[in-house]
């Protein structure tokens, strides 16, 4: 799966009800000033915001863990996409760590598809067809994180 | 194709007010900030404010706060700007502006609209 | 408010000079700096945001750079359609302020 995680530290946007629904929000890309009355950008490649909101901070952009890849870079608007780099991958189970991909299938199994960054290898046995289930399930669901969500500590 | 169509140019008495329109095509309404700027004869450019049809956010500058109201009609992709309590001082161009819900830079723009205030 | 200050209100520069437009910022605007080209009569056209980014379809003759407080616009081989009126603009903090242009002229 891919990795977008957000910083856990950030201070929570204020809580005050404000006079009227259509004021007090900045856009994306952006976060509000202390005394709420302006939007401030994100600055570009540090941190990001990806919603109408009353923060006082943007959320700060995710640094790629050695073992991963940037898919693609943090904008004001967007988060870091980390990606497993090639022969490793994520699990569901475990996402916060990238780990090998299998070599290879167990005696009377055939590889039915290549290690991916969100999946191992896949063997079926020869006769029947039936998946392998050893110590490391295939991950066929491809998860992603929405925006929001803390999908793994920050680097 | 992307385009803002303004609306005609105005003449109008000192103390009147005026509803400027901007009608949006060629993308989605919803998606995208729309903004008012006001250019005076062979001066610089301000912003008015902006107005955001997929939430109805408005914000506006603190200078143009009294002087300036936005709204939208979503069905027929249109912000409109009030300007209420005319002065020469408001006399100018009038642009709509969009831009995507990120940096605030205009990416688009109408053409424009003059308005004269002269008794 | 932040005031953007083009110092420069005339340019004289001829067809295939180089030329330099500048624009400072009464504080840093973190590289959140647009600037567009204004022609007689026409609405403004978006030529580089983020201080330093084209956007689509802008000639590559045009690049922008700077940060902190300092911002500048080159035009790398001046054609005679950019003779015209130039404007920086801060996105950083609402609300989004102008400089006050900058008119490129025929030497």
């Known amino acids: 799966i891919t990795r977008q995680s957000l910083d856990p530290q950030r201070r929570a946007a204020p809580q005050q009800k404000r006079s009227s629904p259509t004021e007090g929000l900045c856009p994306p890309g952006h976060h509000i000033s202390e005394d709420s009355r302006e939007c401030i950008s994100c600055k570009y490649g540090q941190d990001y915001s990806t919603h109408w909101n009353d923060f006082l901070f943007c959320l700060r952009c995710t640094k790629c863990d050695s073992g991963e890849v940037e898919v693609n870079s943090c904008t004001t608007t967007r988060n870091t996409v980390c990606q497993c780099e090639e022969g490793t991958f994520r699990e569901e189970d475990s996402p916060e760590i990238c780990r090998k991909c299998r070599t290879g299938c167990p005696r009377g199994m055939v590889k039915v598809k290549d290690c991916t960054p969100w999946s191992d290898i896949e063997c079926v046995h020869k006769e029947s067809g039936t998946k392998h289930t050893g110590e490391v399930p295939a991950v066929e669901k491809t998860v992603t994180t929405s925006p929001g969500t803390p999908a793994s500590p920050c680097s | 194709k992307v385009q803002l169509q303004q609306s005609g140019a105005e003449l109008v008495k000192p103390g009147a007010s005026v509803k400027l329109s901007c009608k949006a095509s060629?993308?989605?309404?919803?998606?995208?900030?729309l903004h008012w700027v006001k250019q005076k004869s062979g001066q610089g450019l301000e912003w008015i404010g902006w107005f955001y049809p997929g939430n109805n956010n408005i914000k506006y500058n603190e200078k143009f706060k009294d002087k300036a109201t936005l709204t939208a009609d979503k069905s027929s992709s249109t912000v409109y700007m009030e300007l209420s309590r005319l002065t020469s001082e408001d006399s100018a161009v009038y642009f709509c502006?969009?831009?995507?819900?990120?940096?605030?830079?205009?990416?688009?723009w109408g053409q424009g609209t003059t308005l004269t205030v002269s008794s | 408010d932040i005031v953007m200050t083009q110092s420069h209100k005339f340019m004289s520069t001829s067809v295939g000079d180089r030329v330099s437009i500048t624009c400072k910022a009464s504080q840093d605007v973190n590289t959140a700096v647009a600037w567009y080209q204004q022609k007689p009569g026409q609405s403004p056209k978006l030529l580089i945001y983020?201080?330093?980014t084209r956007h689509t379809g802008v000639p590559d003759r045009f690049t922008g750079s700077g940060s902190g407080t300092d911002y500048t616009l080159t035009i790398k081989s001046v054609q005679a359609e950019d003779l015209t009126l130039y404007y920086c603009q801060q996105h950083y903090i609402t609300p989004w302020t102008f400089g006050g242009g900058t008119k490129l002229e025929i030497k």
């Open positions: 060629g993308y989605t309404f919803t998606e995208y900030i």
């Open positions: 502006a969009r831009h995507e819900q990120g940096p605030g830079y205009f990416d688009y």
């Open positions: 983020w201080a330093s």
